[in-house]
Amino acid sequence: CKAMHVAQPAVVLASSRGIASFVCEYASPGKATEVRVTVLRQADSQVTEVCAATYMMGNELTFLDDSICTGTSSGNQVNLTIQGLRAMDTGLYICKVELMYPPPYYLGIGNGTQIYVIDPEPCPDSDF
């Protein structure tokens, strides 16, 4: 397994609709043909997989139909969007990139993006 540098922003604030987007960039010494991107969430020393996608370079990322993630790729940059977030989902979201093909296998893990989610205040009842 060969190590690879992965960069991602330190902090992102989710929108009022619970959507957060960030770029995950991996620094490979060459052009892979098959890449796997996994988003992990770390909270209270627990790490859970949020979503994952394998894609062929030059093609779109395809997450599972029921995934909360969507994404696009351009070169070695993956633009990730996580939807349906609530305040309880605040945490460190780590981007893991694997170069699956051709060999040898490369693995890179980012330092994580702290995503802050603030639940919107409910609208006060109107007297009108």
Partner: antibody, heavy 119, light 106 residues
Framework: DVQLQESGPGLVTPSQSLSLTCSVT?????????WNWIRQFPGNKLEWMGY???????NYNPFLKNRISITRDTSENQFFLKLNSVTTEDTATYYC????????????WGQGTSVTVSS | DIVLTQSPSSLSASLGGKVTITCKTS??????MAWYQHKPGKGPRLLIY???ILQPGIPSRFSGSGSGTDYSFSINNLEPEDIATYYC????????FGGGTMLEIK
């Protein structure tokens, strides 16, 4: 550590074929990477010629496509360059090198072998 | 073919000083840029890949930056062993090299 070493005749006659060998130690050429030939002309210009991948597939510089062949001997962990119909313009120092992926940075190189095309 | 225009072709600098080499590509190469040091009688040595990532074992005096079609490479605190020819290489589409920059110490 990975090491690459080029060998072959230093003098080739015009219109003949140029044949070079790259011997690799410290890594199996079938385990991964692409195994390249690059040449440096007098005056220092570097030109990528082509490669043979770990799986035996090739990719060649379009400018050389009908003259070049890169093959390998997996039992000896060597790969070879054959360049047909050479002219004096093919006089250069020839290097073998390794890179990751379809295209990539060359992380290990041989020290090069000088080839002169002359009658 | 992607063409790389490297400049200057030669330069002279003082020990302890800083030098910068630029490489302009004929189209966007998505940061797939590498830099090499080449000394006579040896094969080129990979210094930097993916625009700015130092190859293991390369001193941090060497650095790279850029995006799109404009890339640069710098050496800080020049040392005598830095005398060499330096090349850029793109690996977005095929592998092509710049024309080289010969560095000498004043």
């Amino acid at each position: 550590d990975v090491q690459l070493q080029e060998s072959g005749p230093g003098l080739v006659t015009p219109s003949q074929s140029l044949s070079l060998t790259c011997s690799v130690t410290g890594y199996s050429i079938t385990s991964g990477y692409s195994w390249n030939w690059i040449r440096q002309f007098p005056g220092n210009k570097l030109e990528w010629m082509g490669y043979i991948r770990f799986d035996g597939n090739n990719n060649y510089n379009p400018f050389l496509k009908n003259r070049i062949s890169i093959t390998r001997d997996t039992s000896e962990n060597q790969f070879f360059l054959k360049l047909n119909s050479v002219t004096t313009e093919d006089t250069a120092t020839y290097y073998c090198a390794r890179n990751y992926g379809t295209w990539g940075a060359m992380d290990f190189w041989g020290q090069g072998t000088s080839v002169t095309v002359s009658s | 073919d992607i063409v790389l225009t490297q400049s200057p072709s030669s330069l002279s600098a003082s020990l302890g000083g800083k030098v910068t080499i630029t490489c302009k590509t004929s189209q966007d190469i998505n940061k797939y840029m590498a830099w090499y040091q080449h000394k006579p009688g040896k094969g080129p040595r990979l210094l930097i890949y993916y625009t700015s990532i130092l190859q293991p074992g390369i001193p941090s005096r060497f650095s790279g930056s850029g995006s799109g079609t404009d890339y640069s490479f710098s050496i800080n605190n020049l040392e005598p062993e830095d005398i060499a020819t330096y090349y850029c290489q793109q690996y977005d589409n095929l592998n092509t090299f710049g024309g080289g920059t010969m560095l000498e110490i004043k």
